[in-house]
């Protein structure tokens, strides 16, 4: 057979689906690898072929499209399971070809089991809600294309094991779940179960997402440098270790990059010929506000180092701030026998 452009195993598309539920999987060739869509390919006389390799096997085999009730079928560039079974887990390949052209890609499909509270090994999308911010909604994800718009499914929302109904600040509204006002107590896993009829059968789609309540943009402020500050003086003798912490508080801001850095005499520490190390630690509050601490450390400080300017800088989407540390050389305490005696005019 002629050469085939093999895009290998597309592990970026780690597809997970629930056991005993419908699943529609689009051939990734048209989404990520080729510059044309299925309709164009079909019009050009190209054929889409599907096959698979079972879990823990090496043998590629054709997909059986003659199962009872068309359990597995293909429609255009979509592979359908109505429904999935646990042993459908494996690597699936879609190949587009004619007599002169061939391109294929494989992707892993994992059929997972869920428990009575919708826990499973499935990776969950995270939806962030702002704390005490007014009405916000989450939408039941990835249900498009499963049933026509003429079909009116029933949607039930759960938090963990429990159905959400008549609750004062969380209201199920069909495909949406509205949070009239979000609190920390609303953190958790929310599941929508979509039930729809098809050809005399009833199917269920289960979709779970994690809600994380985060700091509101209403309360967001520019970075706040807690240390260094005007109340602390770093007084050292040459040869001692100099440790200066830079501690910065960042309000939560969606998609903001928080940065902290030191300058020494206006330059990056790497550009200064001294042995300096910087260690960073990060902690988060319950609403994902962030505190970053960068400790600047010079093991054996010289009198030259004690004359330098040490400035902590911080930046977020809300602004940039800087604060200099007060560093001094310790004045040695006078030795009584010589200095004080001389001072008192002793001969």
């Amino acid at each position: 057979s002629e050469r085939c452009d093999d895009w290998g195993l597309d592990t970026m598309r780690q597809i997970q689906v629930f056991e005993d539920e419908p699943a529609r999987i689009k051939c990734p060739l048209f989404e990520h690898f080729l510059k044309f869509n299925y309709s164009t390919a079909h019009s050009a006389g190209l054929t889409l072929i599907w096959y698979w390799t079972r879990q823990d096997r090496d043998l590629e085999e054709p997909i059986n499209f003659r199962l009872p009730e068309n359990r597995i079928s293909k429609e255009k560039d979509v592979l359908w399971f109505r429904p999935t079974l646990l042993n459908d887990t494996g690597n699936y390949t879609c190949m587009l070809r004619n007599t002169t052209y061939c391109s294929k890609v494989a992707f892993p499909l994992e059929v997972v089991q869920k428990d009575s509270c919708f826990n499973s090994p499935m990776k969950l999308p995270v939806h962030k809600l702002y704390i005490e911010y007014g009405i916000q909604r989450i939408t039941c994800p990835n249900v498009d294309g499963y049933f026509p718009s003429s079909v009116k499914p029933t949607i039930t929302w759960y938090m963990g094991c429990y159905k959400i109904q008549n609750f004062n600040n969380v209201i199920p509204e069909g495909m949406n779940l509205s949070f009239l006002i979000a609190f920390i107590s609303n953190n958790g896993n929310y599941t929508c179960v979509v039930t729809y009829p098809e050809n005399g059968r009833t199917f269920h789609l289960t979709r779970t997402l994690t809600v994380k309540v985060v700091g509101s943009p209403k309360n967001a402020v520019p970075p706040v440098i807690h240390s260094p500050n005007d109340h602390v003086v770093y007084e050292k003798e040459p040869g001692e270790e100099l440790l200066i912490p830079c501690t910065v508080y960042f309000s939560f801001l969606m998609d903001s990059r928080n940065e902290v850095w030191w300058t020494i005499d206006g330059k990056k520490p790497d550009d200064i010929p001294i042995d300096v190390t910087i260690n960073e630690s990060i902690s988060h509050s319950r609403t994902e506000d962030e505190t970053r601490t960068q400790i600047l450390s010079i093991k054996k400080v010289t009198s030259e180092d004690l004359k330098r300017s040490y400035v902590c800088h911080a930046r977020s989407a809300k602004g940039e701030v800087a604060k200099a540390a007060t560093v001094k050389q310790k004045v040695p305490a006078p030795r009584y026998t010589v200095e004080l005696a001389c001072g008192f005019g002793a001969t």
Epitope: Q113, D115, S116, N119, G160, C161, Y162, F167, N189
Partner: antibody, heavy 119, light 107 residues
Framework: QVQLVQSGAEVKKPGSSVKVSCKAS????????ISWVRQAPGQGLEWMGG????????NYAQKFQGRVTITADESTSTAYMELSSLRSEDTAVYYC????????????WGQGTLVTVSS | EIVLTQSPATLSLSPGERATLSCRAS??????LAWYQQKPGQAPRLLIY???NRATGIPARFSGSGSGTDFTLTISSLEPEDFAVYYC?????????FGQGTKVEIK
Amino acid sequence: QVQLVQSGAEVKKPGSSVKVSCKASGGTFSSYAISWVRQAPGQGLEWMGGISAIFGTANYAQKFQGRVTITADESTSTAYMELSSLRSEDTAVYYCARHLHNGIHLDYWGQGTLVTVSS
Amino acid sequence: EIVLTQSPATLSLSPGERATLSCRASQSVSNFLAWYQQKPGQAPRLLIYGASNRATGIPARFSGSGSGTDFTLTISSLEPEDFAVYYCQQGKHWPWTFGQGTKVEIK
């Protein structure tokens, strides 16, 4: 330290109802759910149902549906289990137990409440 | 509902010996299974969740294994305080159900 403290033992007549309380302390009540499990003398454990402390919605075992009502009062961090139309075979120790909203294992248990149904 | 069958009903062993308790489900429960210990006059105590994860404060001598329909609780070396009744519980399907228990008694 999480603690679930249940109400005291009860003696009831057949056909009557009993309401057992379970007060939680040492954790955020609204972050958890409370299940009720019973154990007849010398027998095993039987899950009756559970309630979400934040949403106040309950799940019940089919066997007890219509006869058991589980409620929660967030203001007092207390869950309640009411069993009606009592019969002698309902004589058992009734336990409340805590679990996460999406948890299927019961990590903290109350001390148990003995309910005796006798004419 | 899912029926959990524990075996043996009673296990007679001496301190220091290894105990192996079995729990079999009437259909697959994946790894959605927990084990509890109950001593006379006390409430049950969670030992293992997710078939193999030890709960907080549970000694390392307790371990769980299995997936699907067959599960095992192993106590590597019995201590005097381990003599009790052990229950398995599934959470794969409603209603949650328990096994009938295995009593571990001193020989």
